[in-house]
Amino acid sequence: MMTGTIETTGNISAEKGGSIILQCHLSSTTAQVTQVNWEQQDQLLAICNADLGWHISPSFKDRVAPGPGLGLTLQSLTVNDTGEYFCIYHTYPDGTYTGRIFLEVLESSVAEHGARFQIP
């Protein structure tokens, strides 16, 4: 039975040209995290594997940085980066948990972080 929950940074906004940290946290389970995938819609950004370390998708290598922790840092943001991002946690023995973050990249200098929320 899957008892865990994924806490994410929720809806966030950032300035064009700036950077943002995408962060998820798995709680309420003793399951072992074996791998975390970061995806934008259906596009793979990066994978963090407990044994193999980080794989950054080649097309994002120059503007995606691993971390902090299991999170991901997006740099040199453009308006095209606006959209949904997913953290997919592979765990043992529970299976897969998915969290969602919505990022809005703003032209203006007014970019505030949204509230944190939980996805069961």
Partner: antibody, heavy 119, light 107 residues
Framework: QVQLVQSGAEVKKPGASVKVSCKAS????????MYWVRQAPGQGLEWIAF????????TYAQKFQGKATLTVDTSISTAYMELSRLRSDDTAVYYC????????????WGQGTLVTVSS | DIQMTQSPSSLSASVGDRVTITCRAS??????LSWYQQKPGKAPKLLIY???SLPSGVPSRFSGSGSGTDFTLTISSLQPEDFATYYC?????????FGQGTKVEIK
């Protein structure tokens, strides 16, 4: 097109070292990891290690920790694998391979380098 | 370590046959499995990644399926150039390991 060209065959004595090179072309070298795999005569494939050409960080199979050393020279888009303390059972064809776009698989392979260890 | 077991170790088939090779992982690897083709004296070539995705240039007669521990490579209509040895490989942990290979021979 993407190409990996490896250095030529080597014959070494037990206890010696060998350094195999892998020259990449047709893509941005630092965007991909380079993997090394070996195949003993008549046998299957065995993964040795990979190196992130961007950061220079390496990940090894435990069996090859201290045996293989991976390096890259990004200025000439070339990866290297040095094997130390060679034994007769290190006789094999050694392949370099570019990592995949979506994980730790091997997308494009070099032609292979035969390393023969014999006294 | 995750062990990969292929079956059969060899098979004989004719041109036009449908051929199926299976690969079993000793624990769940989700869909992190790739397949390679190797001809004698040549380097392996990637056929399938992430269990079912075909790289560009690989003929559509090759297909992959499965997830978790059980995977299949299917050649829908065997061609003369398909006689080779096929290997599976997981890409889910260290060490990355390959199956022992399946040799497809001419009947």
């Amino acid at each position: 097109q993407v190409q990996l060209v490896q250095s030529g065959a080597e014959v070494k004595k037990p206890g010696a070292s060998v350094k195999v090179s892998c020259k990449a072309s047709g893509y941005t070298f630092t965007r991909y990891s380079m993997y090394w795999v070996r195949q003993a005569p008549g046998q299957g494939l065995e993964w040795i290690a990979f190196i992130d050409a961007y950061s220079g960080g390496s990940t090894y199979a435990q069996k090859f920790q201290g045996k293989a050393t991976l390096t890259v020279d990004t200025s000439i888009s070339t990866a290297y694998m040095e094997l130390s303390r060679l034994r007769s059972d290190d006789t094999a064809v050694y392949y370099c391979a570019r990592g995949g776009d979506y994980g730790w698989y091997l997308g494009v392979w070099g032609q292979g380098t035969l390393v023969t260890v014999s006294s | 370590d995750i062990q990969m077991t292929q079956s059969p170790s060899s098979l004989s088939a004719s041109v036009g046959d449908r051929v199926t090779i299976t690969c079993r992982a000793s624990q769940s690897i989700y869909s992190y499995l790739s397949w390679y083709q190797q001809k004698p004296g040549k380097a392996p070539k990637l056929l399938i990644y992430n269990a079912k995705s075909l790289p560009s240039g690989v003929p559509s007669r090759f297909s992959g399926s499965g997830s978790g521990t059980d995977f299949t490579l299917t050649i829908s209509s065997l061609q003369p150039e398909d006689f080779a040895t096929y290997y599976c490989q997981h890409h889910y942990g260290n060490p990355l390991t390959f199956g022992q290979g399946t040799k497809v021979e001419i009947k």
